[in-house]
Amino acid sequence: MSSKYPRSVRRCLPLWALTLEAALILLFYFFTHYDASLEDQKGLVASYQVGQDLTVMAAIGLGFLTSSFRRHSWSSVAFNLFMLALGVQWAILLDGFLSQFPSGKVVITLFSIRLATMSALSVLISVDAVLGKVNLAQLVVMVLVEVTALGNLRMVISNIFNTDYHMNMMHIYVFAAYFGLSVAWCLPKPLPEGTEDKDQTATIPSLSAMLGALFLWMFWPSFNSALLRSPIERKNAVFNTYYAVAVSVVTAISGSSLAHPQGKISKTYVHSAVLAGGVAVGTSCHLIPSPWLAMVLGLVAGLISVGGAKYLPGCCNRVLGIPHSSIMGYNFSLLGLLGEIIYIVLLVLDTVGAGNGMIGFQVLLSIGELSLAIVIALMSGLLTGLLLNLKIWKAPHEAKYFDDQVFWKFPHLAVGF
């Protein structure tokens, strides 16, 4: 017989999720309306295509990328979709409440949907560190807290540091990584005897994870250029991201082989490292003046990613309880930092003629921005972790970590729990 959802969760999840959805519908009813103005058809189509690319990245890319566990692939994909759907709704409302509420109603445009999808993507990056150890009710809490924290971070950074949409969204990499790692740190860590096999990867799920990586790889230029309005900057961002991810693929595959004693290629390294260039180039993708720089950055990012995948999992597994195949968290944390450092280096190079005081001030501003993103990520992540530990959520027992059968109906399986 197939296992059933624990009774307590069966009572808790539908009530919690549907009540929340009803509340969101009411908020949309009272506070939102569509943009009634006329946008030219060509601009509308182009804007929609970018939004569509972001949705593909989120639903298929990140959904499948996290599906490599032997017995947790269904949950990874479906829970990702659930979080994306919920996250986008809340992010649209939050963006409206934080930025435009004084003007009355929240106006929904394709641009606000784009912002919301990118905000929801943050949760999908973070959740890689905790998938398999939490149930849907807990994930709902994580979505709400993280989207709220990111929305507030973006507003604060925008107001204090005068950043544009692209720049304050590009902190998503470090924010999502540190948020996810701090949540993971709070959750019960030791895997009990007999569950070690569940966090191992399997061939078919690994193939679907590779599919996810390919979708992300294809659409990463859209992500990095999505919020840039200047045509010349958008073009630079697309080109630079493309070159960076192209080089990081080559580096990932060859670096993975180099890191193995028998020269074999690790699936886990490749899943993650193919995206390295896109993350590292994100913050400064529109500023990099020539392809070779983006390519060098892709190379360095690929090497860091492979190196991190080889040496960090042991530490992360011990300290944070993150399984070996969930390397997105520390990968993005390192590569996001690399991206921010590159941005600061480019800023320094461009301000050399402006006097030391000006350079110092600008570097200080950039470091302040980055520090704020990390601090808010860690604090809100710890808060989320503490919330997720509350008994009311009926978290899966450690013995049932990384197990689809806790959540899904498999009529053909005779394994009971």
């Epitope: 943009d35 103005s37 006329l38 946008e39 601009g43 930025s99 435009q100 106006v107 445009t109 641009f111 540091f161 005068n162 950043t163 544009d164 720049m167 304050n168 309005r229 200047s230 045509p231 010349i232 900057e233 630079n236 529109h286 500023l287 003046p289 941005y343 800023l347 461009d350 301000t351 003629g353 402006a354 000006m358 600008q362 501003l365 950039s366 921005e369």
Partner: antibody
């Protein structure tokens, strides 16, 4: 303190090419976009386009076929060329500091520092 | 292109009056709007950026508000030096576009 100094041909005949240059003094040329704006007599302002230090430019589609902008980092100068001028191009042309390429570096919307303007008259 | 429509196109007021100028965008521009003041024969001067942030050095009697498509510039108590032409500019999408201007005259 940043200030802009501009110069160029003031009187042109129809079909000639307008050429204007703007020099940036006391600011970080590489950090900003640099903008050209024009104002026909008694009319509103019109954004012509912007350029960065490496020559990346965004133009107003209504003028794109006739406009070329360039930047000279060694001299901290940027220039505007407008070909095939007609009487409708008679205007005061302003150069201005545009938005920052980096966040936090002045406000990114720019247009906070302007040149004095150059009056260009197109007449046969 | 995004059209910016200012109203009124001209306005007569006295010193000490409270004056409001409106700018309407043909599509949502969030808060990516700047207000300028221009006096005859002189280059425009930036007063407000990001729809509501006051440029340093500009008197506090000037204020801006709005989000999306409707924006206002308010002068709480007109001074003799405030009589000029006022323009709004959107920088949400390319090409940047200005309003047609509002000429503020002495009554």
């Amino acid at each position: 303190q940043v200030h802009l100094q501009q110069w160029g041909t003031g009187l042109l005949k129809p079909s000639e090419t307008l050429s204007l240059t703007c020099a940036v003094h006391g600011g970080s040329f590489n950090v900003y976009y640099w903008t050209w704006i024009r104002q026909p007599p008694g009319k509103a302002l019109e954004w012509i386009g912007e350029i960065n230090h490496s020559g990346g430019a965004n133009y107003n589609p209504s003028l794109k076929s006739r406009v070329t902008m360039s930047a000279d980092t060694s001299k901290n100068q940027f220039s505007l060329k407008l070909t095939s001028v007609t009487a409708a191009d008679t205007a005061v042309f302003y150069c201005a500091r545009g938005r920052s390429r980096y966040s936090g570096y002045g406000f990114y919307s720019g247009m906070d520092v302007w040149g004095p303007g150059t009056t260009v008259t197109v007449s046969s | 292109d995004i059209q910016m429509t200012q109203s009124p196109s001209s306005l007569s007021a006295s010193v000490g009056d409270r004056v409001t100028i409106t700018c309407r965008a043909s599509q949502v521009i969030r808060n990516d709007l700047v207000w300028f003041q221009q006096k005859p024969g002189i280059a425009p001067k930036r007063l407000i950026y990001a729809a509501s942030s006051l440029q340093s050095g500009v008197p506090s009697r000037f204020s801006g508000s709005g989000f999306g498509t409707e924006f206002t510039l308010t002068i709480s108590s007109l001074q003799p030096e405030d009589f000029a032409t006022y323009y709004c500019l959107q920088h949400f999408s390319y090409p940047y576009t200005f309003g047609q201007g509002t000429k503020l005259e002495i009554k």
